[in-house]
Interface confidence: medium
């Protein structure tokens, strides 16, 4: 309820500024606070043209309608004229705003409501949640008139949400039984005949299912790729592409490599056998390190536990990192820092999977809404690091990139689906106590570990808070941060956001009622989400830090690229480009 004083102030303001014209000083006298006066004055000057009649001025000051350019508007419309939801003013995704509550404090840039802070001639507007549309005006009622600032013109293709087609129209089993005649990739490239010399040479080392008939140059899925049917294409040796079929949304079972949809009581304690690690990649193309992956020189190899790994193992039996802690030296020897050459800056995390391949998030390299499209020559990777800023002589290794490979179906336009990229190093990196590769999961490991409630670990040098300024507290860490987080049930992940979640993602984090906190944050992207297998004591990278709405917010979770589901793509790229050296002239 309003206090008596507030009522008096409101009365003073009405007498001074509504019944007659007032100056800033008079408004300040009535409001007795410079912040409140600034906010009021911004509205009052915006309503300059609506000083009479009095009820029109009152409506204008109330801000539920637009007067003139609509700089007075303070209503709650948060959809643009074409029906796109507005981006939060405080958010940097999908667009980095140049206008915010710091640059325009009087503009009332609350939530994602339409506003006109820069006096745009088309009236109130907002940044949009569509990565392909930076900003757009909104349709706002005009004060005192039966019209709107701009007419609503909904997009003809309707909602951006893909409605599932009738089941009989979709292709089951990721196209493994597909017998159709599609022979062109999603990028419009014609397929090579499977019987061509080039395709035969590439197929020679592949583990193809003999039941899949490789007919002419038709798209097929002979290797059980989770992405669906594909074919080889002309170009650089080994180039391939996926083909566009409408796949059925199938229930996620153990086959897809996780147990995040069903209520699973598969307790790990019942499995006592310590499984031997089976190598998956061809060392000729992958490089060395797989046989020894996930066994850290300063921990597993010395029979030492790190200080929080027991928390992970216990979760199987019964935090930019926010709310994390300093990592121990050698705790995450696969951690890689993706570093921009000029201007020099930390871009993202990444992970070492062999002596010549590094895994990261595609959005670290390519994100058009931010004008981000890095090439090999723009970047360096720094491996073996602990300190964020210091050059760690004799410990870290700095490597140049030979080639970047981004998933061909990475979806930056909508939801960062398939947010994954591989980077091939120009020269193999030497392993040490501080530099060692992580394992990539096989189907059984993914099925047994990727379960709701089981904890994984995220590491990175990203921000310690969602919003920070250099003079308020610690914004960025001095050393690598670590946080352990529980995997969350897929339905809970889906319910926590309006963004379309796919099977190529999973989410993790504490629920509001769990009493613990932690999340990845800006700068941690591309880094690893790892889990320790209780069967063979090795660390596996189950996820890649992909996206989140803010950092460590209640009811929001961090989203991670599902590495196992995209492992076939990883294998294809490595098999086909691991031996080829690309000389850039």
């Amino acid at each position: 309820a309003n206090t008596f004083l507030e009522e008096v102030r409101k009365g003073n303001l009405e007498r001074e500024c509504v019944e007659e014209t007032c100056s800033y000083e008079e408004a300040f006298e009535a409001l007795e606070s410079s912040t409140a006066t600034d906010v009021f004055w911004a509205k009052y000057t915006a309503c300059e043209t609506a000083r009479t009649p009095r009820d029109k001025l009152a409506a204008c000051l109330e801000g539920n309608c637009a007067e003139g350019l609509g700089t007075n508007y303070r209503g709650h419309v948060n959809i643009t004229r074409s029906g796109i939801e507005c981006q939060l003013w405080r958010s940097r995704y999908p667009h980095k705003p140049e206008i915010n509550s710091t640059t325009h404090p009087g503009a009332d840039l609350q939530e994602n409501f339409c506003r006109n802070p820069d006096s745009s001639t088309t009236g109130p507007w907002c940044y949009t949640t569509d990565p392909t549309v930076r900003r757009q005006e909104c349709s706002i009622p005009v004060c005192g008139q039966d019209q709107v600032t701009v007419a609503m013109t909904p997009r003809s293709e309707g909602s951006s949400v893909n409605l599932s087609p009738p089941l009989e129209q979709c292709v089951p089993d990721r196209g493994q039984q597909y017998q159709g005649r599609l022979a062109v990739t999603t990028h419009g490239l014609p397929c090579l005949a499977w019987a061509s010399a080039q395709a035969k040479a590439l197929s020679k080392h592949q583990d193809f299912n003999s039941a899949v008939q490789l007919v002419e140059n038709f798209c097929r899925n002979p290797d059980g790729d989770e992405e669906g049917v594909w074919c080889y294409v002309a170009g650089k040796p080994g180039d391939f592409g996926y083909c566009d079929l409408n796949y059925c949304e199938e229930a996620v079972e153990e086959e897809t490599g996780d147990g995040l949809d069903e209520d699973s009581d598969r307790a790990i304690e019942g499995r006592t056998a310590t499984s031997e690690y089976q190598t998956f990649f061809n060392p000729r193309t992958f490089g060395s390190g797989e046989a020894d992956c996930g066994l850290r020189p300063l921990f597993e190899k010395k029979s030492l536990e790190d200080k929080t790994e027991r928390e992970l193992l216990e979760s199987y039996i019964d935090g930019r990192i926010v709310e994390g802690s300093d990592a121990e030296i050698g705790m995450s020897p696969w951690q890689v820092m993706l570093f921009r050459k000029s201007p020099q800056e930390l871009l993202c995390g990444a992970s070492l999977i062999s002596d010549r391949w590094v895994l990261t998030a595609a959005h670290c390299l390519l994100y058009p809404p931010w004008d981000k499209n890095f090439t090999e020559n723009d970047l360096l990777v720094r491996i073996g690091k602990h300190s964020r800023t210091r050059y760690e002589r004799n410990i870290e290794k700095i490597s140049m990139l030979e080639k970047i490979y981004i998933h061909p179906r990475y979806n930056w336009r909508e939801n960062l689906d398939r947010d994954i990229a591989l980077m091939k190093l120009k020269k193999p990196v030497a392993f040490s106590d501080y530099i060692h590769p992580v394992c990539l999961p096989d189907r059984e490991t993914a099925a047994s570990l990727l379960q709701a409630g089981y904890k994984g670990r995220v590491t990175g040098w990203g921000n310690l808070k969602e919003t920070w300024t250099a003079n308020v507290g610690k914004g960025q860490p001095s050393v690598l941060q670590v946080v352990n987080l529980p995997i969350v049930e897929r339905p809970v992940c889906k319910d926590s956001t309006r963004i379309r979640i796919t099977d190529n993602m999973f989410c993790a984090g504490y629920k509001p009622d769990e009493g613990k906190r932690g999340d990845a944050c800006e700068g941690d992207s591309g880094g690893p989400f790892v889990m320790k297998s209780p069967f063979n004591n090795r660390w596996y990278q189950m996820g890649i830090v992909s996206w989140g709405e803010g950092c460590d917010r209640d009811g929001k979770y961090g989203f991670y690229t599902h590495v196992f589901r995209l492992k076939k793509w990883i294998q294809k790229v490595i098999d086909q480009f691991g031996e080829h050296h690309h000389h850039h002239h």
């Epitope: 300063l298 010395k302 029979s303 030492l304 536990e305 200080k307 027991r310 300093d326 121990e328 030296i329 050698g330 602990h386 300190s387 210091r390 760690e392 002589r393 004799n394 410990i395 106590d433 001095s478 050393v479």
Partner: antibody
Framework: EVQLVESGGGLVQPGGSLRLSCAAS????????MAWVRQAPGKGLEWVSN????????YYLDSLKSRFTISRDNSKNTLYLQMNSLKAEDTAVYYC??????????????WGQGTTVTVSS | DIQMTQSPSSLSASVGDRVTITCKAS??????LAWYQQKPGKAPRLIIS???SLETGVPSRFSGSGSGKDYTLTISSLQPEDFATYYC?????????FGGGTKVEIK
């Protein structure tokens, strides 16, 4: 040869102050966490304080936190321990020690010869 | 704070003897244990870290074992230069704490 040489010890009255120094050579000082460990006459070893490689994080024995300050100057390859409000029970040989792995393992693989601090009136 | 209890506090032995020193932590320290050797008037010398890893240059007659709260330092065949005081140290949680020491004397 890896070497640590402490200096700055001596006789001081209760309530007085001393600043110990430790000059490092033979290794890249700025890569290593460093520590001070003390040993009272005829007694065992007691960890006093640690500092990380760039000096941004410090750790102390709780009972000494308000009186002792560890710092380092990487440009001079020198570690310091500022001791204020000294008490008789601070009498000990103070050793400067280097951390084992260039980081936070808190095992000390290289030690100085020690410098003696005597607090007495 | 984690208490480290070393036993015995002193022992007498002869050259060639097998010597065992134990160190008990007040809680699990997950193998984060180091052993040091100190001779009179000298600084300590690290001989074992991670409960079992012998430091470079340390003779193989020294060995470490144990897990959880209980750890052991064994000298398989005592040599004249091994007569000294031995300390254990935990580095699982701050403050880092040492045992009270075990003085190995000539019988």
């Amino acid at each position: 040869e890896v070497q640590l040489v402490e200096s700055g010890g001596g006789l001081v009255q209760p309530g007085g102050s001393l600043r110990l120094s430790c000059a490092a050579s033979g290794f890249t000082f700025s890569d290593y966490y460093m520590a001070w460990v003390r040993q009272a006459p005829g007694k065992g070893l007691e960890w006093v304080s640690n500092i990380n490689s760039d000096g941004s994080s410090t750790y102390y024995l709780d009972s000494l936190k308000s009186r002792f300050t560890i710092s380092r100057d990487n440009s001079k390859n020198t570690l310091y321990l500022q001791m204020n409000s000294l008490k008789a029970e601070d009498t000990a040989v103070y050793y400067c020690a280097r951390d084992h792995y260039m980081g936070n393992s808190y095992v000390f693989d290289t030690w100085g010869q020690g410098t003696t601090v005597t607090v007495s009136s | 704070d984690i208490q480290m209890t070393q036993s015995p506090s002193s022992l007498s032995a002869s050259v060639g003897d097998r010597v065992t020193i134990t160190c008990k932590a007040s809680e699990d320290i997950y193998n984060r244990l180091a052993w040091y050797q100190q001779k009179p008037g000298k600084a300590p010398r690290l001989i074992i870290s991670g409960a079992t890893s012998l430091e470079t240059g340390v003779p193989s007659r020294f060995s470490g074992s144990g897990s959880g709260k209980d750890y052991t330092l064994t000298i398989s065949s005592l040599q004249p230069e091994d007569f000294a005081t031995y300390y254990c140290q935990q580095y699982w949680s701050t403050p880092w704490t040492f045992g009270g020491g075990t003085k190995v004397e000539i019988k």
